[in-house]
């Protein structure tokens, strides 16, 4: 053999009970002591420090703290140094050293020692991770190292958590003993924070000890707070709130169209939108995620705004008889009333739609002109003007005529046409054609689609010639012999030479 001792490095006992510290020791066989003596010291192995003597086999002299409370259960002759401490109190918590006394110079304090912990609560052991929906085993362990008093275990606050199974007395690695009771159950998220208790009582005594553990149940997030759909006026401030219940707290993320707008590990997350624009209208998603799962919900943000200036697409130039289709579109929220006017006359209207199609079958020159597309909702009104140009062959209007006065003849050729025609005056009797380009004879002015060309002939009063007016554009030509009106009808005055 050699010098050595074996005892638990730590041992526990309930206050007021007792504790048996199992201890064995060995020494070189050749020392062959006639009698083996021993001493238990408290808190220090150095006799020089005069540590309290817990037990001494040679004498009955022990420190006052251990008077009547210490007894050797082991037989030192059999190298068993097991110590019994009775009616333990907190001040007895600490280190216990054994010193073998074999006579002669052979006193040996073993460096191996036992740390006594005086407890007053059962130890409830909850697995490091308790997940909702997954069966868990919770144990209640209490020291059972007192041969005189044996603990009995019962659970507190375990209603609905299953029936306890008592494992009984178990030996730990270093020779200490524990009483163990097990509780098997499947926790729910509602069990998070639940206080589970265990009670150790000692029959025929008033000793009773309780311990509690708060359940830390891990569970995936559920979004519990979320705006319903939100309507906001352009330029206003919008707050979107997302709150989730989970353990541990989730990573909350606000997203739109796959873009992360804001995220934080929190139970709730506010997304603040300052001065919202229509571009921010859309669906916002809140994603809540932790290691145990995820949840997501969406909220629609509707940004209300006045219509944008309408845009007009379609044919703005048409040939008489064609069908014209014009599309007026805008953007607004809510959708607007769209109306197309021409000269204050409503041609077409649509309610709560963002576009209006105007169809004009077989356009005539009367359809030519300025049109207005007006978009209106409760937040405002915008309008866009557009011109429709109807192209057609010349039409010689009835007010075309010639009139003589003294020595001058004036002929008016009034033509309606689009595009503008070329006008020529033909005098068949003289085999002469006068074009509008001949400015000394012809004066032209245009008003809208009507062109008035005036031919002035001097010295023709006595015998006014026949005058034919011909108007021509890419759609055709029209000729008219201009009727003469009597002198009584037209009065010409020519002043000057």
């Amino acid at each position: 053999g050699h010098w050595g001792a074996w005892m638990p490095s730590s041992i526990s006992a309930f206050e007021g009970t007792c504790v048996s510290i199992p201890c064995r020791f060995d020494f070189p066989d050749e020392l062959r002591p006639a009698v083996v003596h021993g001493v238990w010291y408290f808190n220090s192995p150095y006799p020089k420090n005069y540590p309290p003597v817990v037990f001494k086999s040679r004498t009955q002299v022990v420190h006052e703290s251990f008077q009547g409370r210490s007894r050797l259960l082991g037989d030192l002759g059999l190298r068993n140094c097991t110590l019994l401490l009775s009616n333990v109190s907190p001040e007895l918590g600490g280190k216990y050293y054994f010193r073998g006394d074999l006579g002669g110079y052979n006193q040996y304090t073993f460096s191996e020692h036992s740390v006594l912990d005086i407890v007053n609560t059962p130890n409830i052991v909850v697995p490091p991770e308790v997940v909702a929906g997954t069966e868990v085993e919770v144990s209640c362990m209490v020291p059972d190292n007192c041969p005189e008093l044996r603990p009995e275990l019962s659970w507190l606050g375990h209603e609905g958590l299953g029936e306890p199974a008592v494992l009984g007395r178990l030996r730990e690695d270093e020779g200490t003993w524990v009483q163990v009771s097990l509780l098997h159950f499947v926790p729910t998220r509602e069990a998070n924070g639940h206080r589970l208790g265990c009670q150790a009582s000692f029959p025929n005594t008033t000793l009773q000890f309780e311990g509690y553990a708060s359940m830390d149940v891990k569970y995936p997030p559920v979004i519990v707070e979320m705006n319903s759909s939100v309507e906001a006026i352009e330029g206003s401030h919008v707050s979107l709130l997302c709150g989730a219940d989970s353990n541990p707290p989730p990573l909350l993320t606000w997203m739109r169209d796959g873009t992360v707008l804001r995220e934080a590990v929190a139970e709730s997350l506010l997304l603040e939108l300052e001065e919202v624009t229509p571009a921010e209208d859309g669906v916002y998603a809140c994603l809540a995620e932790n290691a145990y799962g995820q949840d997501n919900r969406t909220v629609g943000l509707s940004v209300m705004y006045a219509p944008w200036k309408p845009t007009v697409n379609g044919t703005m130039v048409a040939v008489e008889g064609e069908t014209v289709s014009i599309l007026c579109s805008t953007q607004s929220n809510p959708d607007p009333i769209l109306t197309i006017f021409k000269e204050k006359q409503i041609l077409s209207t649509v309610i709560y739609e963002s576009e209006l199609q105007l169809e004009l079958p077989a356009v005539s020159p009367e359809d030519d002109g300025e049109y207005w597309c007006v978009a209106e909702n409760q937040y405002g009104q915008r309008a866009t003007a557009f011109n429709l140009s109807v192209e057609f062959a010349p039409v010689l209007l009835l007010e075309s005529h010639c009139a003589a006065a003294r020595d001058t003849v004036q002929c008016l050729c009034v033509v309606k046409s689009n595009p503008e025609p070329s006008v020529a005056f033909e005098l068949p009797s003289r085999n002469v054609t006068v074009n509008e380009s001949e400015r000394e004879f012809v004066y032209s002015e245009r008003s809208g689609l009507v062109l008035t060309s005036i031919l002035t002939l001097r010295g023709q009063a006595q015998a006014p010639p026949r005058v034919i007016c011909t108007a021509r554009n890419l759609y055709g030509a029209k000729s008219l012999e201009l009727p003469f009106q009597g002198a009584h009808r037209l009065m010409w005055a020519k002043i000057g030479p």
Epitope: H2, W3, P28, D29, E30, L31, R32, P33, A34, P45, Y46, P47, K48, L102, G103, G104, Y105, N106, Q107, Y108, T109, S111
Partner: antibody
Framework: QVQLVQSGSELKKPGASVKVSCKAS????????MNWVRQAPGQGLEWMGW????????TYADDFTGRFVFSLDTSVSTAYLQISSLKAEDTAVYYC???????????????????WGQGTLVTVSS | DIVMTQSPDSLAVSLGERATINCKSS????????????LAWYQQKPGQPPKLLIY???TRESGVPDRFSGSGSGTDFTLTIINLHTEDVAVYYC????????FGQGTKLEIK
Amino acid sequence: QVQLVQSGSELKKPGASVKVSCKASGYTFTNYGMNWVRQAPGQGLEWMGWINTYTGEPTYADDFTGRFVFSLDTSVSTAYLQISSLKAEDTAVYYCARNPINYYGINYEGYVMDYWGQGTLVTVSS
Amino acid sequence: DIVMTQSPDSLAVSLGERATINCKSSHSVLYSSNQKNYLAWYQQKPGQPPKLLIYWASTRESGVPDRFSGSGSGTDFTLTIINLHTEDVAVYYCHQYLSSLTFGQGTKLEIK
């Protein structure tokens, strides 16, 4: 040089007490243990026990428990043997003898007694 | 306890001759930890305290003449004095200090 000087002879009546002193010099007192050895007239040597001068811890041989007390006064490098309730059979020469101690950690090893006092004769007689 | 038995109880040797004293222990005094024999020899002259001669069974204490030597191991040990001098007349004790300390009963050495 090392010296252990013991107190002088004592004549005591049975039932009385006696205290024998042993004053050490010439070495560091607490580095050596102090032993007590008895030699009855015409008899051999009997080891009574020893006292650890560093810790003050006494160890008694099995035949010398109870009436025999070892003590120290390290301030004057002196060890004491006190015998109470003296009996006639306690008549003997009492020797103190030092022994080297090798300390290591919380333990030590004791070696042979190398220096002895001159002895103190205690006579117990009515 | 370990019992030490010396032989002979007394011994007469002529001056200049060799004296041999034996000592037997009831149990081995060889310590396994350091392989040393925890045995010593003392010389005691009348009216004087014992004087250390040999320790560790064979190591001579300083100042002791080399006429004195010790031998043996385990349970059997011998003290040898060669070239015996007049001043060697004394009682010799063997002593074990392994376990609870014990002495032999002594051997008285005289001049023949």
